[in-house]
């Protein structure tokens, strides 16, 4: 740690005195203190000398000596009082700038330590301090206003009692700055804009901050626009607003608009896009396939995206058949606005019934005309199966009818014993019918197919089963020949209720 000579914490001298302060360290040393006139600074090897041969009240202050090369950063200090009967205060600053909630040191240094008992802090022109001003005094450093507030930004004077009268210092202006958390907050409205050529448009760029020192500008395709600025102050924030008014837009007004605001903390920007079109437009689209297949009893949401300008004058969902003239319930139709010019319309179809298959159309209208988007909804069904015994061209034939969607595949099984359903251990023979005859195949309906199995003689202790399956499920029908005549068994599980 450096050593100061004279080795006293405080030194009191009279004006005009010669003062020499020597600092000695292991390495090079440096003096630091308030900038004040008349000091001469010179080095002599590992010592540094601070001297004046004509001390004035302005030399009052704390002088610190440091060793820049010392990693521990040790220092020594001495406080000098230049005791001037005419000047009780040495004011080191015209202005003090702090952030809110910091301590503000008003550097009125007392030139005579004896005066400490009679000091006070006042506002200029003898006005008292504001209520709740919490302050303390140090003869070495001055008055400290603790946790300074913005409202305490005032002009202050330090007062000392000398011979029964108050002697004031020159004034010190305290500037308490609001803590700026970051760049100004920005809004640019609208977020997106579409206009038909010749229409009017308005774009508003506004920025706000707790501090008045910030700049804001609006630019179009990287060109700064010259727009008069409106300023305001409310909710403890400064606001600056730029409003671009266009009476009749043209294609050159289209493009990217950016609102940019900056302060000492940095820059914020936000952008929007302005589209100028020749005429009204209305576009319908869907991310879904327009041809939908859903299993009966399940639900489906049909979604349509609408892009339109000007806004929609009307819209609705319509069921176009073929099963009934019912219309979708309005409560199942939902509209959400993604932004000003894009909307999503959803039709919810829960627990679909057979009569609800068919075409659903979304219709929308704006000044640009009508547009429609149609979905085709086909229901999927598991196969239903029935078997009968008949004679075709004199031959005994088992006839299997299977109905479902998608079109079912048919397999015949012959197994030993009488059973409702053949299991693997009983199977004697299997026939696949790759091409069953299609009896009916209409849009939105089930597909009915027929498969024939010619049997020369029915074995009485055996079962003939027709199985049909598709992507939804399977169905079967067991045919058991008995002496009194053929007997058929639909399987227990075939109790289908849509």
């Amino acid at each position: 740690i450096p050593v100061i000579e004279p080795s006293v914490p405080e030194l009191v001298v009279k004006p005009g005195a010669t003062v020499t302060l020597r600092c000695v360290g292991n390495g090079s040393v440096e003096w630091d203190g308030p900038p004040s006139p008349h000091w001469t600074l010179y080095s002599d090897g590992s010592s540094s000398i601070l001297s004046t041969n004509n001390a004035t009240f302005q030399n009052t202050g704390t002088y610190r000596c440091t060793e820049p090369g010392d990693p521990l950063g040790g220092s020594a200090a001495i406080h000098l009082y230049v005791k001037d009967p005419a000047r009780p205060w040495n004011v080191l600053a015209q202005e003090v700038v702090v952030f809110e909630d910091q301590d503000a040191l008003l550097p009125c240094l007392l030139t005579d330590p004896v005066l400490e008992a009679g000091v006070s802090l006042v506002r200029v022109r003898g006005r008292p301090l504001m209520r709740h001003t919490n302050y303390s005094f140090s003869p070495w450093h001055g008055f400290t206003i603790h946790r300074a507030k913005f409202i305490q930004s005032q002009d202050y004077q330090c007062s000392a009692l000398m011979g029964g009268r108050k002697v004031m210092s020159i004034s010190i202006r305290l500037k308490v700055q609001k803590v700026i958390p970051g760049p100004p907050a920005l809004t640019l409205v609208p977020a997106e804009l579409v206009r038909i050529r010749g229409e009017a448009a308005q774009i508003v760029c506004s920025a706000s901050s707790v501090d008045v020192n910030f700049d804001v500008f609006l630019q179009h395709n990287n060109t700064k626009l010259a727009i008069p600025q409106q300023s305001d102050f409310h909710n403890n924030r400064y606001q600056k607003v730029l409003t671009l008014n266009l009476d009749q837009v043209d294609f050159q007004h289209a493009g990217n608009y950016s609102c940019v605001a900056s302060n000492v903390q940095g820059k914020h920007s936000t952008s929007m896009f302005f589209r100028v079109v020749e005429s009204a437009y209305l576009n319908l689209s869907s991310e879904q396939n327009l041809i939908q297949e859903v299993t009966v009893g399940e639900g489906l949401n049909l979604k349509v995206m609408v892009e339109a300008y000007p806004g929609l004058q009307g819209f609705n969902w319509t069921y176009l058949g073929p099963f009934s003239d019912h219309q979708p319930e309005p409560k199942l139709a939902n509209a959400t606005t993604k932004d000003t010019y894009r909307h999503t319309f959803t039709l919810s179809l829960p627990r679909l019934k057979p009569s609800e298959a068919g075409r659903y159309s979304f219709l929308a209208r704006n000044p640009g005309g009508w547009r429609a988007l149609t979905f085709e909804l086909t229901l999927r069904y598991p196969p239903e199966v029935s078997v009968i015994w008949t004679f075709i061209n004199g031959s005994g034939t088992l006839l299997c009818a299977a109905s479902g969607y998608p079109q079912p595949n048919v397999t015949w099984l012959q197994c030993s014993g009488h059973t409702d359903r053949c299991d693997e251990a009983q199977v004697l023979q299997v026939w696949d019918d790759p091409y069953p005859e299609v009896l009916s195949q209409e849009p939105f309906h089930k597909v009915t197919v027929q498969s024939l199995l010619t049997v020369e003689t029915l074995e009485h202790n055996q079962t003939y089963e027709c199985r049909a399956h598709n992507s939804v499920g399977s169905g079967s029908w067991a045919f058991i020949p008995i002496s009194a005549g053929a007997h058929t068994h639909p399987p227990d599980e075939f109790l289908f209720t849509p």
Epitope: D32, G33, W39, T40, V97
Partner: antibody, heavy 117, light 110 residues
Framework: QVQLQESGPGLVKPSETLSLTCTVS????????WNWIRQPPGKGLEWIGY???????NYNPSLKSRVTISLDTSKNQFSLKLSSVTAADTAVYHC???????????WGQGTLVTVSS | QSVLTQPPSASGTPGQRVTISCSGS????????VNWYQQLPGTAPKLLIY???QRPSGVPDRFSGSKSGTSASLAISGLQSEDEADYDC???????????FGGGTKLTVL
């Protein structure tokens, strides 16, 4: 070794506020006093003002009404704001560390600020 | 207009001694110490002399300063080509309560 680096916009419009920041590295801002000095093209150096580490400031009387110098000890930075600028404020702006006898022992490289519309 | 007065230019040949003057008033040079700065082209000013005649470490002893009354001077002996630069004088001014500068002297090494 103490180093100072100025930063801020190089172009400012007339009547707007010039804002510069000086970042100090290699030493603490919590001692000495920290100055802004400028040099208009082809002219001499002009002292703008200083801030002492405690937040105390003194400004050149010719600029006092337009200047604010502030300190951010947490970032080891100090800042200059000069309001209502005109073309006469076009200059290279330097930040510098001041010693108690009025000498400036460390300087920033300087940043040219042009005031123009 | 600078508060301290310096000649706008000075010149000398290598090896020569050159002196640059700086004059002020009682409120600055007359009552406070003088500092000199060297500014090489495109660089920041560098403290060359402080407290009238003190050299910071690293400054060659070819550079010396002196003060008398309200005037000061900077002498460069054994002039070298790398000394070609602008030289500025400065002093604390009591009425300004801050430092004042000269207009700068451009030294050319011929």
């Amino acid at each position: 070794q103490v180093q100072l680096q100025e930063s801020g916009p190089g172009l400012v419009k007339p009547s707007e506020t010039l804002s510069l920041t000086c970042t100090v590295s290699g030493g603490s801002i919590s001692s000495y006093y920290w100055n802004w000095i400028r040099q208009p093209p082809g002219k001499g150096l002009e002292w703008i003002g200083y801030i002492y580490y405690s937040g105390s400031t003194n400004y050149n009387p010719s600029l006092k009404s337009r200047v604010t110098i502030s300190l951010d000890t947490s970032k080891n930075q100090f800042s200059l704001k000069l309001s209502s600028v005109t073309a006469a404020d076009t200059a290279v702006y330097h930040c510098a560390r001041g010693r108690l006898n009025g000498a400036f022992d460390y300087w920033g490289q300087g940043t040219l600020v042009t005031v123009s519309s | 207009q600078s508060v301290l007065t310096q000649p706008p230019s000075a010149s000398g040949t290598p090896g020569q001694r050159v002196t640059i003057s700086c004059s002020g008033s009682s409120s600055n040079i007359g009552s406070n110490t003088v500092n000199w700065y060297q500014q090489l082209p495109g660089t920041a000013p560098k403290l060359l002399i402080y407290s009238n005649n003190q050299r910071p470490s690293g400054v060659p002893d070819r550079f010396s300063g002196s003060k008398s009354g309200t005037s000061a001077s900077l002498a460069i002996s054994g002039l070298q080509s790398e000394d070609e630069a602008d030289y500025d004088c400065a002093a604390w001014d009591d009425s300004l309560n801050g430092p004042v500068f000269g207009g700068g002297t451009k030294l050319t090494v011929l």
